[in-house]
């Protein structure tokens, strides 16, 4: 919401994840086999067809370095709650190794578990809605947001304590992730910081900051998955 | 369990300055604001003011911004109040109290001002 | 300044009786209203707040309604535990404000 469409494949590891051929979340190629995106994206996809799309820009035109691929195995957090924006992470092995290249590349993450400093710039990438009207663009967008201190988050005006050390936030003030960005990377310095929450909040609005699931937090469990 | 817990009573005279300390444990300190409330004899709440333990970014009524000062110390997670040049108005219970999820107060606590 | 102006002052009611104190602020504070309760000698505690949500652990006979200026905290039986004074409190805009109380005595 807010942003500007991204440069074509200057983020390589951009996914998007899908189910039945349709956009559905944001995801992040964190090594050759998978993708790292959010619980709850999966939580209404019951018996459908999930699939990573790897090496885009646009959604529907032809481009030389996109690949659908098959999921092997979808690994939810252990303690993702369909209730709950806790632990709303999600690891999917594609069917094979991805092929790397150019538009299709892993992207570090963090493991060091501190804080990024608040007003931090961070980039946050997606094929969600760009406006109120729910408009979904075809081609990859992108907005760079402040990050935002915990304490002034967990105000009652905001998200009323509910913002763990395990989740950060980032400034809303009508630039934002919405709808359909869940799942997707916040990237902050080159470094995978924080993963877009798939909880309903509304976009847009400045007392209701973007919320972001930690990676460093949960080091030891995406190990863990991958080894 | 969260706890917050405040200095003793405290005597002073007019002109003078007090601290007030609220020690707070059972959760991260720098996760959220503190802020200041306070309640004169047989009268309603007053607030005070607010301090982001991160940042250490303040919010005052304007009544006490002249007078009051708020600090924290985050390496004993603590958050103080100093209210200087005193008078009998100030005579109070001051409460400290988290902003954000449940409403955690401390137990108060008394300043006299009297010559 | 927003002004919360509560009402009534104090009240007499018996235990079961249904009891409703009222809060107007003086301008629009969308839902961001708590409401604190409050016994001798003691700090307040919290019972509701964005104008309708219960703390845990309060019972189910306190909840609290309204948006914009005009907000309501029921107690919909009165317990015996329940008699003391009540504060609303706005926390949309700077300097937070609290209404001047209202004391729920046994009558």
């Known amino acids: 919401l807010g942003g500007r469409e991204a440069e074509a494949h200057a983020r390589p590891y951009m996914a998007s994840v899908q189910l039945n051929g349709a956009h559905l979340c944001g995801g992040v190629l964190v090594a050759e086999q998978w993708v790292l995106s959010a619980a709850h994206c999966l939580e209404d996809a019951a018996d459908g067809k999930v699939q990573v799309l790897l090496g885009a820009h646009s959604l529907s035109q032809p481009e030389p370095s996109k690949r659908l691929y098959d999921v092997l195995r979808a690994v939810p957090h252990p303690d993702s709650q369909p209730d709950t924006i806790d632990h709303d992470l999600l690891l999917l092995q594609l069917s094979e190794k991805a092929t790397l290249g150019p538009a299709v590349r892993p992207l570090p993450w963090q493991r060091v578990d501190r804080d990024v400093a608040p007003g931090t710039l961070c980039d946050v990438a997606g094929w969600g809605i760009v406006n109120h009207a729910g408009r979904r663009p075809d081609s990859l967008q992108h907005v760079l947001l402040p990050v935002l201190d915990r304490a002034t988050c967990n105000r009652r005006t905001h998200h009323d304590g509910a913002i763990t050390e395990r989740l950060m936030c980032a400034e809303s003030n009508r630039r934002d992730s919405c709808k359909g960005d869940s799942g997707g990377p916040l990237v902050c310095g080159g470094v995978l910081e924080g993963v877009v929450t798939s909880g309903s909040r509304v976009c847009g609005n400045r007392k209701k900051p973007g919320i972001y699931t930690r990676v460093a937090s949960y080091a030891a469990w995406i190990d863990s998955v991958l080894a | 369990e969260v706890q917050l817990v405040q200095s003793g009573a405290e005597v002073k005279k007019p002109g003078a300055s007090v601290k007030v300390s609220c020690k707070a444990s059972?959760?991260?300190?720098?996760?959220?604001?503190m802020y200041w409330v306070r309640q004169a004899p047989g009268q309603g709440l007053e607030w005070i003011g607010e301090?982001?333990?991160?940042?250490?970014?303040?919010n005052f009524n304007e009544k006490f911004k002249s007078r009051a000062t708020l600090t924290v110390d985050t390496s004993t997670s603590t958050a103080y109040l100093e209210l200087s040049s005193l008078r009998s108005e100030d005579t109070a219970v001051y409460y400290c109290?988290?902003?954000?999820?449940?409403?955690?107060w401390g137990q108060g606590t008394l300043v006299t001002v009297s010559s | 300044d927003i002004q919360m102006t509560q009402s009534p002052s104090s009240l007499s009611a018996s235990v079961g009786d249904r009891v409703t104190i009222t809060c107007k602020a003086s301008?629009?504070?969308?839902?961001?209203v708590a409401w604190f309760q409050q016994k001798p000698g003691k700090a307040p505690k919290g019972l509701i707040y964005?104008?309708?949500s219960r703390y845990s652990g309060v019972p189910s006979r306190f909840s609290g309604s309204g948006s914009g200026t005009d907000f309501t905290l029921t107690i919909s039986s009165l317990q015996p535990e329940d008699f003391a004074t009540y504060y609303c409190?706005?926390?949309?805009?700077?300097?937070?404000?609290f209404g001047q109380g209202t004391k729920v005595e046994i009558k």
């Open positions: 109290a988290r902003e954000g999820g449940f409403a955690y």
């Open positions: 059972g959760y991260t300190f720098t996760s959220y604001y």
């Open positions: 301090i982001n333990p991160t940042s250490g970014d303040t």
């Open positions: 301008q629009n504070v969308d839902t961001d």
């Open positions: 964005s104008a309708s």
């Open positions: 409190q706005q926390y949309n805009n700077y300097p937070l404000t």
